[in-house]
């Protein structure tokens, strides 16, 4: 088990604004420090 206890957000629970603010990856192409998919 991953020691970080990540939660999977229920996307249907959020409006558009909140969905855009979720901890989901931003950088789809670059090799900068980023959130793992």
């Amino acid at each position: 088990m991953n020691s970080f206890n990540y939660t999977t957000p229920d996307y249907g629970h959020y409006d558009d604004k909140d969905t855009l603010d979720l901890n989901t990856p931003v950088d789809k192409t670059s090799n900068t420090l980023r959130v793992p998919d």
Epitope: P9, N23, V26, D27
Partner: antibody, heavy 114, light 112 residues
Framework: QIQLVQSGPELKKPGETVKISCKAS????????MSWVKQAPGKGLKWMGW????????TYTDDFRGRFAFSLETSASTAYLQISSLKNEDTATYFC???????WGQGTTLTVSS | DVVMTQSPLTLSVTIGQPASISCRSS???????????LHWLLQRPGQSPKSLIY???KLDSGVPNRFTGGGSGTDFTLKINRVEAEDLGVYYC?????????FGVGTKLEIK
């Protein structure tokens, strides 16, 4: 309601380090990312990157890699921006904002001068 | 990086008259999730920016309906159908589709 409250103005000398705080309230801090935005005096806005408040992983844009560090104190619902080896061109107002810039802090003015 | 081009840079408008700001991007802002992540902010003098419109045309909470946003692809517009005194400030369009997110230079709305 959602609020982001930043630390007060800073006056620093070149070469020093500053740490700006951004305390969030009114929502679950670890659900939503936090962005940082720079605004030099009389200039426009520049996105510095963001930090995943769940994993703690920062993402920096090219112009803000190296001397800049995003960090968290999740127990206090607080995000931090640290700038080291300060330069005159770091003089600006720094804003925290929830990831997609719909909610903003009031800004922290940093002046770097010898 | 995606370049966001705003025009005009300054807009001088009489209260009660309409105003329009154009924003063009150097690449399409239609994202792979089907959303066009073009947003508008207003920064009043001495204040932090405030979200006005998100996803091209959605009015943020508390924003009066005299503001409307439209456009698609690379060409977007913010319109105010009757300018009020509280509307003065700098309007920024910005894109959250392509990394890094980028802003227009801003359009300063002045009251005549």
């Amino acid at each position: 309601q959602i609020q982001l409250v930043q630390s007060g103005p800073e006056l620093k000398k070149p070469g020093e380090t500053v740490k700006i705080s951004c305390k969030a309230s009114g929502y679950t801090f670890t659900t939503f990312g936090m962005s940082w935005v720079k605004q030099a005096p009389g200039k426009g806005l520049k996105w510095m990157g963001w930090i995943n408040t769940n994993s703690g992983m920062p993402t920096y844009t090219d112009d803000f890699r190296g001397r800049f560090a995003f960090s968290l104190e999740t127990s206090a619902s607080t995000a931090y921006l640290q700038i080291s080896s300060l330069k005159n061109e770091d003089t600006a107002t720094y804003f925290c904002a929830r990831k997609s810039l719909f909610y903003w802090g009031q800004g922290t003015t940093l002046t770097v001068s010898s | 990086d995606v370049v966001m081009t705003q025009s005009p840079l300054t807009l001088s408008v009489t209260i009660g008259q309409p105003a329009s700001i154009s924003c063009r991007s150097s690449r399409s802002l239609l994202d792979s999730d089907g959303k066009t992540k073009l947003h508008w902010l207003l920064q009043r003098p001495g204040q932090s920016p405030k979200s006005l419109i998100y996803l091209v045309s959605k009015l943020d909470s508390g924003v009066p309906n005299r503001f409307t946003g439209g456009g698609s692809g690379t060409d977007f517009t913010l319109k105010i159908n009757r300018v009020e005194a509280e509307d003065l400030g700098v309007y920024y369009c910005w894109q959250g589709t392509h990394f890094p997110w980028t802003f227009g230079v801003g359009t300063k709305l002045e009251i005549k």
